[in-house]
Amino acid sequence: QEGKFSGPLKPMTFSIYEGQEPSQIIFQFKANPPAVTFELTGETDNIFVIEREGLLYYNRALDRETRSTHNLQVAALDANGIIVEGPVPITIKVKDINDNRPTFLQSKYEGSVRQNSRPGKPFLYVNATDLDDPATPNGQLYYQIVIQLPMINNVMYFQINNKTGAISLTREGSQELNPAKNPSYNLVISVKDMGGQSENSFSDTTSVDIIVTENIWKAPKP
């Protein structure tokens, strides 16, 4: 009987999660005489197969990062191999899973900041990429400072924009940083996917060396 998994030849779209071992048919096309067999063309990547009787399936796990959409065409052929129906477009949308970890573009970053700089004004960006779909949590990155060294009086002098990776001074940092006392700092920054919200997220870390420079601007004397 015709239903969710079988029916006549017509344009169709199917969504399949990447990474799944192929376990079931995608669709069973039904031939209308004089059609007796089917033919598959397009972006098959030797993964998608149609048996001559119209059984469309895939023979190995899909990878969204290789191809997020497979544009296929199915035609119905008669017993002489002549196309009698179609070809019609069959679209396979590959749904993302969290199978890639975020990675920083650099394992070490270096930057400098002038003392008394305005709090919240970025002086350095760290950047990570994740091959997963940025429109899903799998590819949504969350930056945070893990460690600041040295840490004086348990006060954070630096902050990071969780979404953009922009590093800037906190209010305390703007007021208290003094190159004469401590000219350099090291931050360990982490990035997590899943928007940082899941125990199943992947993460990466990077090191940031920051030099504090003297503010040579002096307030004019009255």
């Epitope: 005489p33 004089p34 007796v36 008669d78 017993a79 002489n80 191999g81 002549i82």
Partner: antibody, heavy 122, light 108 residues
Framework: QVQLVQSGAEVKKPGSSVKISCKVS????????IHWMRQAPGQGLEWIGY????????VYAQKFQGRATLTADKSTSTAYMELSSLRSEDTAVYYC???????????????WGQGTTLTVSS | DIQMTQSPSSLSASVGDRVTITCRVS???????LHWYQQKPGKAPKPLIY???TLASGVPSRFSGSGSGTDYTLTISSLQPEDFATYYC?????????FGQGTKLEIK
């Protein structure tokens, strides 16, 4: 080995009908289409149509639609071509032929019958 | 209907000659759908080349085919006495299947 053996020569009067047979052996009759062509004296080949015995699917060239009838008898592995309302221009050698298995990717006429001469004359 | 035009219609040549027959198709077809047949007087045609360039079973290697789109050729590299016959191209692209008018190859 594959063979297509056609019935003998025919002489017919204008307006009458003829039925030519093509008995096959050496392969599964229902796995291949059977095509019919004709060749008028000193002329080229003209395709009449085909039958797929497995499903009794028949396709005709428009020129022969309504005048040619292709049938198949699975029990005897024999295909037939009947041509009605004969006229002198139908005088020709008629051939049956088959392409490879219908699952093939390469379709051409790989085996032919020996031909049947039809003469239409008053 | 797809028209098939062969040239030349007839050709005189000698044993050992290299001969080329051309077939022009009235619309573009896939090269897998163009075939050549050989016919001798009083006999049924026999397959020579299918899919433009693949030799049918038992066909000697002096025969070759090439082409794409609308223009196809059959070449006999060194004519043998048994090659004198009529040659037909045929399209398998669409119904009705059509043949060229034939090229008669005669001994000079």
């Amino acid at each position: 080995q594959v063979q297509l053996v056609q019935s003998g020569a025919e002489v017919k009067k204008p307006g009458s009908s003829v039925k030519i047979s093509c008995k096959v052996s050496g392969y599964t009759f229902t796995d291949h289409t059977i095509h019919w062509m004709r060749q008028a004296p000193g002329q080229g080949l003209e395709w009449i149509g085909y039958i797929f015995p497995r499903d009794d699917i028949v396709v005709y060239a428009q020129k022969f639609q309504g005048r040619a009838t292709l049938t198949a008898d699975k029990s005897t592995s024999t295909a037939y071509m009947e041509l009605s309302s004969l006229r002198s221009e139908d005088t020709a050698v008629y051939y049956c032929a088959r392409p490879p298995y219908y699952y093939s990717r390469n379709f051409y006429f790989d085996y032919w019958g020996q031909g049947t001469t039809l003469t239409v004359s008053s | 209907d797809i028209q098939m035009t062969q040239s030349p219609s007839s050709l005189s040549a000698s044993v050992g000659d290299r001969v080329t027959i051309t077939c022009r198709v009235s619309s573009i077809i896939s090269s897998s759908k163009l075939h050549w047949y050989q016919q001798k007087p009083g006999k049924a045609p026999k397959p020579l080349i299918y899919g433009t360039s693949t030799l049918a079973s038992g066909v000697p290697s002096r025969f070759s085919g090439s082409g794409s789109g609308t223009d196809y050729t059959l070449t006999i590299s060194s004519l043998q006495p048994e090659d004198f016959a009529t040659y037909y191209c045929q399209q398998w692209s669409n119904y009705p299947f059509t043949f060229g008018q034939g090229t008669k190859l005669e001994i000079k």
